[in-house]
């Protein structure tokens, strides 16, 4: 009669994260009597993972009933497996002994490797903004996947980038790993519709890779260009200025209006109008009494945008021209929200 | 103190039905396994049947398999052996045995390779 | 089948050998059960090759290597005059049993 072998027939099982890991292991005698155990790794530290003498193991379920007497097949299955799960799983048996049962011989183990998907990949931005031509870096980062292998791309607008670097962690043996690049991007005035992807493919996910985005709206600036215009006289003594604010973005703008130096009012962009690549445009307009005035009047167009140092226009009014007429104190009317009348 | 003790013996004819019955004490029942080995006058020791802890895994000697029933009752503490058709052959005395091994799951099967303790034994003698 | 000598004698204080032999190495327990007369209770005297029960004289050991086993009494005496039946399974035979040795001390 020969001894007893433990015959584990497979050296490798892949199993998917959540679903049910089979371990299969028989024994080829009914002796000597004593309990199978089955551990994961070797020597002192192993784990046990089911002891069919005694125990609570809630994940592992048994492959044949091992009530039956001739039973040698000592199969487990282990549910919910997760990248944790992973490592060599060995089938031990052990005969009856006093007053401990005695470690009798162990299968050659089964190695279980577990598939985990990416997490979502997560791609973040600078945490402030950038105006056209500068480079910007993006990071994206997923977690949680196994085995190591995985492909990263970066796209803009569905332009892949090059310009990138990626790393995935840790570099020796792990139960799972986690990818982080980064990638450089160069900002154009035409950016505010723009998407920085970032790809991530894997054999879990049975080539529909996962995708995290970033709208460059929330990191581009797109500072203003100013224009200041001098309207034609739309009544007798009246002319209309202008100040053109044009491609900017975001939204956030405060304009103000200086006669000679001095601040004669101040709003905020409110009523704007969008252009197609997403920058706005925005005028304001000053109706100018010029028979208030003896002297030329220099008009400035003042704009914070963003929060960033101001920039402005001046627009120089000539008023020589212009009759004036004597002892008029008359005050000008106020026509409209953008109009300002200048004594 | 673990003691075994059996009952049911005597003169029996053959063709009958025997039935023997070993009460156990000091000790569970249910987690050893329990067998019968019978010697025959000038013989050596003779396995006859026998019973795992989990109670349903059972085994039989050649001598005796198709009419020997052993079974058990652990609220009894008791573990009978039912033989039909009783021969001549059968004529010796019945020990009742229990293992060593505390066994508390099923593949213990029904084992009786360490025997730790013997009951006295119940004579049984076929003749007609 | 085990095999085992018929018979063995010994002058007390002599140490006594009983070998069991399994005709494979798959008897992987023995137990060693004294027999003072035909028909009255055996008593395990060495079970798990080596493990003495309580009650049991130091004197009575036993050891197993491959597919044999040896009972040994050290320093015999005259009340361990008895028949020595060696006990073990294989996959088939939950219970096996040796013909049994009968020890004689001179």
């Known amino acids: 009669e020969e001894e007893l072998q433990v015959i584990q027939p497979d050296k490798s099982v892949l199993v998917a994260a959540g679903e049910t890991a089979t371990l299969r292991c028989t024994a080829t005698s009914l002796i000597p009597v004593g309990p199978i155990q089955w551990f994961r790794g070797a020597g002192p530290g192993r784990e046990l993972i089911y002891n069919q003498k005694e125990g609570h193991f809630p994940r592992v379920t048994t492959v044949s009933d091992l009530t039956k007497r001739n039973n040698m097949d000592f199969s487990i299955r282990i549910g919910n497996i997760t990248p944790a799960d992973a490592g060599t799983y060995y089938c031990v048996k052990f005969r009856k002994g006093s007053p401990d049962d005695v470690e009798f011989k162990s299968g050659a183990g089964t190695e279980l490797s577990v598939r985990a998907k990416p997490s979502a990949p997560v791609v973040s931005g600078p945490a402030a903004r950038a105006t056209p031509q500068h480079t910007v870096s993006f990071t994206c980062e997923s977690h949680g996947f196994s085995p190591r292998d995985i492909t990263l791309k970066w796209f803009k607008n569905g332009n892949e980038l090059s310009d990138f670097q990626t790393n995935v962690d840790p570099v020796g043996e792990s139960v799972s790993y986690s990818i982080h690049s980064t990638a450089k991007v160069v900002l154009t005035r035409e950016d505010v519709h723009s998407q920085v992807i970032c790809e991530v493919a894997h054999v879990t996910l049975q080539g529909d890779p996962l995708r995290g985005t970033a709208n460059l709206s929330e990191t581009i600036r797109v500072p203003p260009t100013l224009e200041v215009t001098q309207q034609p006289v739309r009544a007798e003594n009246q002319v209309n200025v202008t100040c053109q604010v044009r491609k900017f973005y975001p939204q956030r703008l405060q304009l103000t209006w200086l006669e000679n130096g001095n601040v004669s009012r101040t709003e905020t962009a409110s009523t704007v109008t969008e252009n197609k690549d997403g920058t706005y445009n925005w005028m304001s307009w000053l109706l100018v009494n010029v028979s208030a005035h003896r002297d030329d009047v220099k008009l400035t167009c003042q704009v914070e945008h963003d929060g960033q140092p101001a920039v402005s226009k001046s627009h120089d009014l000539k008023v020589s021209a212009h009759p004036k007429e004597q002892g008029s104190n008359t005050a000008a009317e106020n026509t409209g929200s953008n109009e300002r009348n200048i004594y | 103190a673990v003691t075994l003790d059996e009952s049911g013996g005597g003169l029996q004819t053959p063709g009958r039905a025997l039935s023997l019955v070993c009460r156990g004490s000091g000790f569970s029942i249910s987690s050893y396994n329990m067998g019968w080995v019978r010697q025959a006058p000038g013989k050596g020791l003779e396995f006859i049947a026998s019973?795992?802890?989990?109670?349903?895994?059972?085994h039989y000697a050649p001598a005796v398999k198709g009419r020997a029933t052993i079974t058990r009752d652990v609220g009894q503490s008791t573990v009978r052996l039912q033989l039909n058709n009783l021969r001549a052959e059968d004529t010796g005395t019945y020990f009742c045995?229990?293992?060593?091994?505390?066994?508390?799951?099923?593949?213990?099967?029904?084992?009786?390779?360490?025997?730790?303790?013997w009951g006295h034994g119940t004579e049984v003698i076929v003749s007609s | 089948a085990l095999t085992q000598p018929s018979s063995v004698s010994a002058n007390p204080g002599e140490t006594v050998k009983i070998t069991c032999s399994g005709d494979n190495s798959a008897h992987y327990y023995y137990g060693w059960y004294q027999q003072k007369s035909p028909g009255s209770a055996p008593v395990t005297v060495i079970?798990?090759?080596?493990k003495r029960p309580s009650g049991i004289p130091s004197r009575f050991s036993g050891s197993a290597s491959g597919s044999t086993a040896t009972l040994i009494i050290t320093g015999v005496q005259v009340e361990d005059e008895a028949v020595y039946f060696c006990?073990?399974?294989?996959?088939?035979?939950?219970?096996?049993f040796g013909a049994g040795t009968t020890l004689t001390v001179l």
């Open positions: 079970y798990y090759n080596d």
């Open positions: 045995a229990k293992d060593a091994y505390q066994c508390s799951y099923a593949t213990c099967n029904d084992y009786l390779d360490t025997i730790d303790a």
């Open positions: 019973i795992g802890s989990d109670g349903s895994s059972t």
């Open positions: 006990g073990s399974a294989d996959s088939s035979n939950p219970a096996i």
